[in-house]
């Protein structure tokens, strides 16, 4: 993927500084495994510059390769909770719409830990909506230094 | 956040390539939970290009959104050490000065593991000093491939 | 490290957009602890833009500071597998050739977990080949959302 001559002449801002860092707003209703996110300076240190939120889900507005990262910490958790005393807890980040592009991008199980954290590079297209599905019966922490989700445009 | 016309005309270097990757130097004295870092080519593969070290703590010299990442591995550790025989071990990365901007940015507990690793996007300002506080009674590894801390400027 | 005047005049593409995200192809033969990677749109969401693969190992083609990231999930794994019933499982990412630059960049043990994920900034040079060595007797998952390895050029 090369930049066109036109792109090379444009100011840097138009090449894509799209970036977002979100904090957990709430979990979904009973049959909805999705986490619902929020962002904005009024909320603390979360922000959206380019991407947008659609009912708590992150929607991409610029094509490109993105670094996607996430950390989720389970609330009131011990290694006992996650391993033996509760249903296995898994976090999956994926494109959930449009349906034609639905795919799991990143998946982690908590096993005997109470936090998962990872990151990956992935191509995303304008209109892709990312969902973060938490299965299991343990509640995620809403502390902003324990649970967060973000994307960063890195290349056309 | 848009680049000003003046910024658009400046050479790329002035837009901010600030970046640092540090290795563990030592832990603090008894009542000081902070980890003390060091960086520079003479030490191996660590470096500072822009940010600086102030008594082992990382100080930011350019405003912007940064990707902050860290990995800490506990020395002489087994899952037994972290779960049953010691005070819970937690790592927190935060702005510790100026006091008016003090906040926890990233927090992880070791639970039954011996390594934590995570990353997040966060706005930082010139003069912010980042501290990495390790609570608990287990010593962190000084191996440069096991324990490291870094920041990367990604956007104004 | 400053950009030369010549570099400042070059189109942005020549400053380095080098980036790759790989998926697991296969493990090595008996005495070879290396993981063998593959990438390309035909395989899914993996890609190489700049770096190249040499017999399943990632080779760098442009000098610079890179963000290296990896996630490896063990297949058919439980916390019991990784802790008590198997040889300790460890993942190390390093420069394996040229031999003169051989070094371990990133090392993680699975302990009682089934996934490791981390990232770090490191200087890499044209011709450096990165190897990912998995020790232990547990097989890594080939699911593309569970096991992946990538690099991103971030600065000259």
């Amino acid at each position: 993927q090369r930049l066109s001559r036109a792109q090379q002449q444009l100011p840097l801002e138009s090449l894509g500084w799209d970036i977002a860092e979100l904090q957990l707003n709430h979990t979904g209703p009973q049959q909805d495994p999705r986490l619902y996110w929020q962002g904005g300076p009024a909320l603390g240190r979360s922000f959206l510059h380019g991407p947008e939120l659609d009912k708590g889900q992150l929607r991409i507005r610029r094509d490109g390769i993105y670094m996607v990262h996430i950390q989720v910490t389970l609330a009131i958790c011990s290694s006992t909770s996650t391993s033996r005393h509760h249903h296995p807890t898994t976090l999956a980040v994926g494109i959930c719409s449009p349906a034609s592009r639905s795919i799991s991008l990143l998946r982690l199980s908590f096993h005997q830990g109470c936090t998962i954290a990872s990151q990956r590079l992935t191509p995303l297209a304008r209109g892709d909506t990312l969902c973060t599905n938490l299965t299991g019966t343990l509640l995620p922490s809403r502390n902003t230094d324990e649970t967060f989700f973000g994307v960063q445009w890195v290349r056309p | 956040q848009r680049l000003s016309r003046a910024q658009q005309q400046l050479p790329l270097e002035s837009l901010g390539w600030d970046i640092a990757e540090l290795q563990l130097n030592h832990t603090g004295p008894q009542q000081d939970p902070r980890l003390y870092w060091q960086g520079g080519p003479a030490l191996g593969r660590s470096f500072l290009h822009g940010p600086e070290l102030d008594k082992g703590q990382l100080r930011i010299r350019r405003d912007g959104i940064y990707m902050v990442h860290i990995q800490v591995t506990l020395a002489i550790c087994s899952s037994t050490s972290t779960s049953r025989h010691h005070h819970p071990t937690t790592l927190a990365v935060g702005i510790c000065s100026p006091a008016s901007r003090s906040i926890s940015l990233l927090r992880l507990s070791f639970h039954q593991g011996c390594t934590i690793a995570s990353q997040r996007l966060t706005p930082l300002a010139r003069g912010d000093t980042l501290c990495t506080n390790l609570t608990g009674t287990l010593l962190p590894s000084r191996n440069t491939d096991e324990t490291f801390f870094g920041v990367q400027w990604v956007r104004p | 490290q400053r950009l030369s005047r010549a570099q400042q005049q070059l189109p942005l593409e020549s400053l380095g957009w080098d980036i790759a995200e790989l998926q697991l192809n296969h493990t090595g033969p008996q005495q070879d602890p290396r993981l063998y990677w593959q990438g390309g749109p035909a395989l899914g969401r993996s890609f190489l833009h700049g770096p190249e693969l040499d017999k399943g190992q990632l080779r760098i083609r442009r000098d610079g500071i890179y963000m290296v990231h990896i996630q490896v999930t063990l297949a058919i794994c439980s916390s019991t597998s990784t802790s008590r019933h198997h040889h300790p499982t460890t993942l190390a990412v390093g420069i394996c050739s040229p031999a003169s630059r051989s070094i371990s960049l990133l090392r993680l043990s699975f302990h009682q977990g089934c996934t490791i994920a981390s990232q770090r900034l490191t200087p890499l040079a044209r011709g450096d080949t990165l190897c990912t060595n998995l020790t232990g007797t547990l097989l890594p998952s080939r699911n593309t959302d569970e096991t992946f390895f990538g690099v991103q050029w971030v600065r000259p």
Partner: antibody
Framework: EVQMVQSGAEVKKPGASVKVSCKAS????????IHWVRQAPGQGLEWMGD????????SYNQKFRDRVTMTRDTSTSTVYMELSSLRSEDTAVYYC????????????WGQGTLVTVSS | DIVMTQSPDSLAVSLGERATINCRAS??????????MHWYQQKPGQPPKLLIY???NLESGVPDRFSGSGSGTDFTLTISSLQAEDVAVYYC?????????FGGGTKVEIK
């Protein structure tokens, strides 16, 4: 529809044991922990413990730890709560309960089983 | 164990009037961005019914005249306009740690 159906009332003598069953339906049995809560006549509610049907592991209120055992039979989606060394103050309605999404609060309850301990 | 203290023990309120029940925990039940306090309604001969979870979330199917508030150690259940079918005993419960404990109950009657 989630349902929790408990076994019938029991009368026991002091020192004996009682085993109350709770059959769950309407959801995947091995997903949600099942808790036991008791209520003495005219009194409040008391949490006794819970069991995770996926593994059979249980957590007990320290007050009952030496006398209570919770087990499960995944083939019939049934959990059991056995209380031993019964005393008159164990006379109560025993409820099983589970949750709808996250653990910690109880959206679904059994109808209750009255256990009377009397000589 | 965390001790839950409800007040008042009983409450008589006119139909259509507001009823307020308080619950105090012996130490904070708030952590990780939540308050682990839940409220139940129990009518004679029936099991308890969940009304409010995590301090202020209305359980599905519960009339919106019920609301919860509070954080830390002090919590309130409010019935904004008492109806005849609201006559019952109300319990608070925490799930901050094991063992979970309940308040002693508040009996609500019509004046």
């Amino acid at each position: 529809e989630v349902q929790m159906v408990q076994s019938g009332a029991e009368v026991k003598k002091p020192g004996a044991s009682v085993k109350v069953s709770c059959k769950a339906s309407g959801y995947t049995f091995t997903t949600y922990n099942i808790h036991w809560v008791r209520q003495a006549p005219g009194q409040g509610l008391e949490w006794m413990g819970d069991i995770y049907p996926g593994t059979g592991d249980a957590s007990y209120n320290q007050k009952f730890r030496d006398r209570v055992t919770m087990t499960r039979d995944t083939s019939t989606s049934t959990v059991y709560m056995e209380l031993s060394s019964l005393r008159s103050e164990d006379t109560a309605v025993y409820y099983c309960a589970t949750f709808s999404r996250f653990d910690g609060w109880f959206a679904y309850w059994g109808q209750g089983t009255l256990v009377t301990v009397s000589s | 164990d965390i001790v839950m203290t409800q007040s008042p023990d009983s409450l008589a309120v006119s139909l259509g009037e507001r009823a307020t029940i308080n619950c105090r925990a012996s130490r904070s039940v708030s952590t990780s961005g939540y308050s682990y306090m839940h409220w139940y309604q129990q009518k004679p001969g029936q099991p308890p019914k969940l009304l409010i979870y995590l301090a202020d979330n209305l359980e599905s199917g519960v009339p919106d005249r019920f609301s919860g508030s509070g954080s830390g150690t002090d919590f309130t259940l409010t019935i904004s306009s008492l109806q005849a079918e609201d006559v019952a005993v109300y319990y608070c419960q925490h799930s901050r740690e094991l063992p979970y404990t309940f308040g002693g109950g508040t009996k609500v009657e019509i004046k």
